[in-house]
Interface confidence: medium
């Protein structure tokens, strides 16, 4: 706001006022009269740039007159009082109310004094973020979706991710006239490494005190990725039983584990217990390749592991494997 004058009257008002769609807003406007100087205010007038006539007038003796009486009201101006406060309240803000307004004091003998105020009509958007569940497509696809609905002006959406990828943002008219819905997709090539990781959608809007952060946990459906653990190449005869574990990562979760060997069914010393294969002690050397076949809703994948049980004393009496 301008600094107080030393010898002249000054109309004080903010250069810009924000208001929310459907709400009411006050356009502040004050006359500052320095020192002992006297002024006669005969009229307060509000007009809109580009429109002929006044939208609100307050005469010193006739009181207020409004172009839209149900939507406008002088906040402080009253008959029989010094007209120093021309602040105007607007009700039921509409998109078309946005624009430049002039607050004018007709004073004597100083003359007319006015100031311009820019009214910004805002609409606070509603923000949502959701995962876009995908399979291994081998090409870039949307994995997360962030939507800012009914903002004015349009919200600004950015993404934060350690996974790579790129945004694809579009705009469409909102439900209320003059508002905008912004949709942003986070696009990348799906991989099993992406599944369960998160990306963050950041929505910025001038109606927010601070940006809104929405985290999305990604979902990538993929068939099992299988490996077998539990064998350390040092299994010997006469040791205790040992265990092989079929390690499977998949989404959705595995529905079944099937153990076999390259020769066919499991030998008597190998007992399948779901994802684990129990290897009982053997009395003669063996050289067997075990197969673990894991199934989920997207398919089956398998892993092989060759196990040798050798002669010779174990280094430790604890078992065929170090477990």
């Amino acid at each position: 706001w301008p600094p107080p004058g030393t010898g002249d009257i000054i109309v004080q008002a903010p250069t810009q006022v924000p208001g929310f769609l459907g709400d009411s807003v006050t356009l502040p406007c004050y006359l500052q009269v320095p020192g002992m100087e006297e002024t006669h205010v005969s009229q307060l007038t509000w007009s809109r740039h580009g429109e002929s006539g006044s939208m609100a007038v307050f005469h010193q003796t006739q009181g207020p007159n409004y172009s839209e009486p149900k939507r406008l009201e002088f906040v402080a101006a009253r008959l029989g009082t010094e007209l120093r406060d021309a602040s105007l309240r607007m009700f039921g803000l509409r998109v078309e109310d946005e624009g430049n307004y002039t607050c004018l004091f007709v004073t004597f003998p100083q003359g007319s004094r006015s100031v311009d105020i820019w009214l910004r009509v805002l609409a606070k958007p509603q923000n949502t973020a959701e995962v876009q569940k995908v399979q291994l497509t081998g090409k870039p696809v949307p994995v997360a979706r962030c939507v800012s609905t009914g903002g004015r002006p349009p919200a600004h959406i950015t993404w934060h991710s350690d996974l790579g990828g790129m945004p694809n943002t579009s705009q469409a008219p909102g439900f209320l006239s003059g508002t905008v819905t912004v949709t942003s997709l986070w696009i990348l090539v799906p991989s099993s490494q992406v599944d369960g990781k998160s990306v963050t959608c950041k929505v910025e809007h001038e109606s927010f005190e601070k940006p809104q952060l929405l985290t999305v946990n990604l979902t990538v459906y993929y068939p099992p990725e299988v490996s077998i653990s539990g064998y350390d190449n040092n299994w010997y005869l006469s040791q205790n039983e040992a265990t092989l574990t079929c390690d499977a990562r998949s989404n959705p979760e595995p529905t079944g584990y099937n153990w076999s060997t390259t020769m066919g069914p499991l030998p008597p010393f190998a007992v399948a217990q779901g994802a684990q294969l129990l290897i009982r002690p053997v009395d003669k050397p063996i050289n067997t390749t075990f197969i673990c076949n894991v199934t989920n809703a997207l398919g089956a994948r398998q892993a092989e592991l060759t196990v040798q049980v050798k002669e010779g004393p174990p280094s430790e009496p604890s078992g065929m494997s170090s477990n």
Epitope: E37, Q43, H59, Q60, T61, P109, G111, S112
Partner: antibody, heavy 121, light 110 residues
Framework: QVQMQQSGAELVKPGASVKLSCKTS????????ISWLKQKPGQSLEWIAW????????NYNQKFTGKAQVTVDTSSSTAYMQFSSLTTEDSAIYYC??????????????WGAGTTVTVSS | QAVVTQESALTTSPGETVTLTCRSS?????????ANWVQEKPDHLFTGLIG???NRAPGVPARFSGSLIGDKAALTITGAQTEDEAIYFC?????????FGGGTKLTVLQ
């Protein structure tokens, strides 16, 4: 064309009253400040009062409070000044003047030709 | 009531610059006095020249300018013309009323 057409000369007796008129045209009367001024022959000007035509709001030089009364009729865009209890001291030319605004200040913009009032028995 | 004093008469020549002043009995003239300057020519033809100390009225030649000089209001005519010969009145605003000066008779000698 902007005009301030004042009523004709008046010859009145002491103690009487007189009502001077100032019919305006060519501008928005209702948003005008109009002052009345007095000038005695060969002398300076004296400000009597102003009126804001839109509201009828007035402000008087204290010297003329009770002596002069200024009014307006917006329907005819006419300003009036009634002078009462006239004395020979009130003999003068009376001007109505519309104030114009430069935006930053008012000036004495449009002058009537003046009405000569002579107070004599 | 305040008294406003002007030079009773000044003489200048065409093309010269002349300054008319306006003093207040209450002290220094300030912008809060919103000095006005009015020209009167024969047959009571009045023209408002300046309002609000230094704001020239529309249509008034640029050679007329208003200002504050020291503690007085001033009307300066830069490059006076013969048609500028007239009586010039200043008027000062005192919170709620105007007070006119006695007027300055300006003669422009050929």
């Amino acid at each position: 064309q902007v005009q301030m057409q004042q009523s004709g000369a008046e010859l009145v007796k002491p103690g009487a009253s007189v009502k001077l008129s100032c019919k305006t045209s060519g501008f928005t009367f209702s948003s005008s400040y109009i002052s009345w001024l007095k000038q005695k022959p060969g002398q300076s000007l004296e400000w009597i009062a102003w009126i804001y035509a839109g509201t009828g709001d007035t402000n008087y030089n204290q010297k003329f409070t009770g002596k002069a009364q200024v009014t307006v009729d917006t329907s005819s865009s006419t300003a009036y000044m009634q002078f009462s209890s006239l004395t020979t001291e009130d003999s003068a030319i009376y001007y109505c003047v519309r104030h114009g605004s430069t935006g930053r200040g008012w000036y004495f913009a449009v002058w009537g030709a003046g009405t000569t009032v002579t107070v004599s028995s | 009531q305040a008294v406003v004093t002007q030079e009773s008469a000044l003489t200048t020549s065409p093309g010269e610059t002349v300054t008319l002043t306006c003093r207040s009995s209450t002290g220094a003239v300030t912008t809060s006095n919103y000095a006005n300057w009015v020209q009167e020519k024969p047959d009571h033809l009045f023209t408002g020249l300046i309002g609000g100390t230094n704001n020239r009225a529309p249509g008034v030649p640029a050679r007329f300018s208003g200002s504050l000089i020291g503690d007085k209001a001033a009307l300066t005519i830069t490059g006076a013309q013969t048609e500028d010969e007239a009586i010039y009145f200043c008027a000062l605003w005192y919170s709620n009323h105007f007070v006119f000066g006695g007027g300055t008779k300006l003669t422009v000698l050929q």
